[in-house]
């Protein structure tokens, strides 16, 4: 499955777990493998393109979410989700232009 599809569905599912169920553990269980995949680095041209387009913002969001783990300040997680949604929007719109 293409990276943009995995992130698209993963972010939606994680958002429902967090905002709908307040299930932070479940949210991290979805996000952590996606970030690990990104951290391993791209192996195809499409993955390289994805990494260039969204890598910096996704890493920033991840840093805010990791900060929450030590701070327990909900605002840190909200900052992460602002960025995640921003990326989700871009993926939704970008996908249309290339398919």
């Amino acid at each position: 499955i293409l990276w943009h599809e995995q992130w698209h569905e993963g972010l939606e599912e994680a958002s429902r777990l967090y905002f709908g169920d307040r299930n932070v553990k479940g949210m991290f269980e979805i996000l952590e493998p996606l970030h690990a995949m990104l951290e391993r680095g791209p192996q195809t041209l499409k993955e390289t393109s994805f990494s260039q387009a969204y890598g910096r913002e996704l890493t920033e969001a991840y840093e805010w979410s990791q900060r929450y783990k030590t701070s327990a300040v909900v605002m840190d997680l909200d900052r992460a989700w602002d960025i995640y949604y921003h990326v989700f929007q871009k993926i939704s719109r970008h996908h249309h232009h290339h398919h």
């Epitope: 939606e12 958002s15 905002f19 939704s92």
Partner: antibody, heavy 124, light 107 residues
Framework: EVQLVESGGGLVQPGGSLRLSCAAS????????IHWVRQAPGKGLEWVAS????????SYADSVKGRFTISADTSKNTAYLQMNSLRAEDTAVYYC?????????????????WGQGTLVTVSS | DIQMTQSPSSLSASVGDRVTITCRAS??????VAWYQQKPGKAPKLLIY???SLYSGVPSRFSGSRSGTDFTLTISSLQPEDFATYYC?????????FGQGTKVEIK
């Protein structure tokens, strides 16, 4: 209370231009997606365009791409649809609607508030 | 673009009937489907979002479900105020697309 009020519709000749406005209250246009959806007389709903001001993202239906421009003035909490090179087939009631993911707990866009609509008639 | 094929285009039913409207997506759209009700001369109203979540204030007789790329809106017991046109909409990827609509009329 959330409200969307469209204005700017009217009668215009083919090839002409109109600018529709969507004045929002009760929420922040900056952090919401604003959509324009139209409905030709006796027909179904057709999505036209949307804007997400937070990231300056815009998208258009193929039928209006290159002719219509969606924008927002966050200081006025208002979205706009600039319509150029209008055609008879653009005749419709134009609705603006919003999606605010903070309200829905879902990223998938469902339009929870709609304006009353403004009629655009393209005819000579 | 993702096509949403809605059926039937119209149906006649009586008060108290169970009514089912279906939308089929031309490709996977996950659960990114919403349902709207529209009455003549009025703006659409949101009923269901994310395929099966009931929007606040909407009566519980309305429900939504998903099976793969097939999405269903069910009205368990049709009420007089439910006679209207219903639309499905996908927002998985842009452009957003609507179904053609289903007009629910009084038998």
């Amino acid at each position: 209370e959330v409200q969307l009020v469209e204005s700017g519709g009217g009668l215009v000749q083919p090839g002409g231009s109109l600018r529709l406005s969507c004045a929002a209250s009760g929420f922040n246009v900056y952090s919401s997606s604003i959509h324009w959806v139209r409905q030709a007389p006796g027909k179904g709903l057709e999505w036209v365009a949307s804007i997400y001001s937070y990231s300056s993202s815009t998208s258009y239906a193929d039928s209006v791409k290159g002719r219509f421009t969606i924008s927002a003035d966050t200081s006025k909490n208002t979205a706009y649809l600039q319509m150029n090179s209008l055609r008879a087939e653009d005749t419709a009631v134009y609705y603006c609607a919003r999606f605010d993911w903070y309200q829905r707990y879902s990223f998938y866009e469902a339009m929870d508030y709609w304006g009353q609509g403004t009629l655009v008639t393209v005819s000579s | 673009d993702i096509q949403m094929t809605q059926s039937p285009s119209s149906l006649s039913a009586s008060v108290g009937d169970r009514v089912t409207i279906t939308c089929r997506a031309s490709q996977s759209v996950s659960s990114a489907v919403a349902w709207y009700q529209q009455k003549p001369g009025k703006a659409p109203k949101l009923l269901i979002y994310s395929a099966s979540s009931l929007y606040s204030g909407v009566p519980s007789r309305f429900s939504g479900s998903r099976s793969g790329t097939d999405f269903t809106l069910t009205i368990s017991s049709l009420q007089p105020e439910d006679f209207a046109t219903y639309y499905c909409q996908q927002s998985y990827f842009y452009p957003v697309t609507f179904g053609q609509g289903t007009k629910v009329e009084i038998k």
